[in-house]
């Protein structure tokens, strides 16, 4: 789960160790703040849940690319 370190900073301290099916994902946020222990991705699921994931994992990178393509194609 994302943990709020301060009002402005969200960090991931633990990442999910299983793949989330792409059809369950709605969006993502990159976590790059140097005050966080590591760079991470927060996926938001279609049920509104937020899950931290490791951007070094292939399924995470593939899911991000898929969401980027879907998001752009949805734009008018």
């Amino acid at each position: 789960q994302p943990d709020s370190v301060s009002i402005a900073i969200t960090c991931c301290f633990n990442v999910i160790n299983r793949k989330i099916p792409i059809q369950r994902l709605e969006s993502y946020t990159r976590i790059t703040n140097i005050q966080c222990p590591k760079e991470a991705v927060i996926f938001k699921t279609k049920r509104g849940k937020e899950v931290c994931a490791d951007p070094k994992e292939r399924w995470v990178r593939d899911s991000m690319k898929h969401l980027d393509q879907i998001f752009q194609n949805l734009k008018p």
Epitope: T32, I34, P37, K38, E39, P55, K56, D68, F71, Q72
Partner: antibody
Framework: QVQLVQSGAEVKKPGSSVKVSCKAS????????MHWVRQAPGQGLEWMGR????????KFDPKFQGRVTITADTSTSTAYMELSSLRSEDTAVYYC??????????WGQGTTVTVSS | DIQMTQSPSSLSASVGDRVTITCKAF??????RAWYQQKPGKAPKLLIH???SLEHGVPSRFSGSGSGTDYTLTISSLQPEDFATYYC?????????FGGGTKVEIK
């Protein structure tokens, strides 16, 4: 705070090799990717390649494949870039930078490499 | 490789001006672009990455827009410290590539 401190300027002969180091403080390099980007005098930026220090997996611009070696030592939080078969066109400032997503939010100060006979 | 074409290569502007720099990718990069500022003798500094992510500490006068292959960096009101060279970069696919740069000079 994060600091990437690079080794000093080098003057090299054509055909030789150069090895530049990049020591990180304020971050764990095994949690990120370490990239190398160069900039020839008065020119733009050119990505050379990167390493995942966690498993030593590397990726390079094909232009440099076979001529560049990127390594990392997690025990000293240091990344290295070695470029071989140097030619005058390799005269440039070489930067290390961090970023797992493919963009670079922290950079070293740069190392000037001059290739001259 | 995905080629990035930046324009103009240089421009002259005054303090307070609105400045726009454009970057065109030779294929769709799905908003995966970054903008950097570089001053002489210094390393580049990340300004913006992705669709709208302004890097921590970067003034709000900097903004990015665009989609597909066409992207823009806008400085809403140029300040004296903004005179520098700006680069776009795509991070959709490796090898990551940069635009040729735009030098913003004092008019």
């Amino acid at each position: 705070q994060v600091q990437l401190v690079q080794s000093g300027a080098e003057v090299k002969k054509p055909g030789s090799s150069v090895k530049v180091s990049c020591k990180a403080s304020g971050l764990t390099i095994s949690h990120t990717y370490m990239h190398w980007v160069r900039q020839a005098p008065g020119q733009g930026l050119e990505w050379m390649g990167r390493i995942d220090p966690d498993n030593h997996n590397t990726k390079f611009d094909p232009k440099f494949q076979g001529r560049v070696t990127i390594t990392a030592d997690t025990s000293t939080s240091t990344a290295y870039m070695e470029l071989s078969s140097l030619r005058s066109e390799d005269t440039a400032v070489y930067y290390c930078a961090r970023g797992v997503f493919g963009f670079f939010d922290h950079w070293g100060q740069g190392t000037t490499v001059t290739v001259s006979s | 490789d995905i080629q990035m074409t930046q324009s103009p290569s240089s421009l002259s502007a005054s303090v307070g001006d609105r400045v726009t720099i454009t970057c065109k990718a030779f294929e769709d990069i799905y908003n995966r672009r970054a903008w950097y500022q570089q001053k002489p003798g210094k390393a580049p500094k990340l300004l913006i990455h992705g669709a709208t992510s302004l890097e921590h500490g970067v003034p709000s006068r900097f903004s990015g827009s665009g989609s597909g292959t066409d992207y823009t960096l806008t400085i809403s009101s140029l300040q004296p410290e903004d005179f520098a060279t700006y680069y776009c970069q795509q991070f959709w696919s490796a090898p990551y590539t940069f635009g040729g740069g735009t030098k913003v000079e004092i008019k």
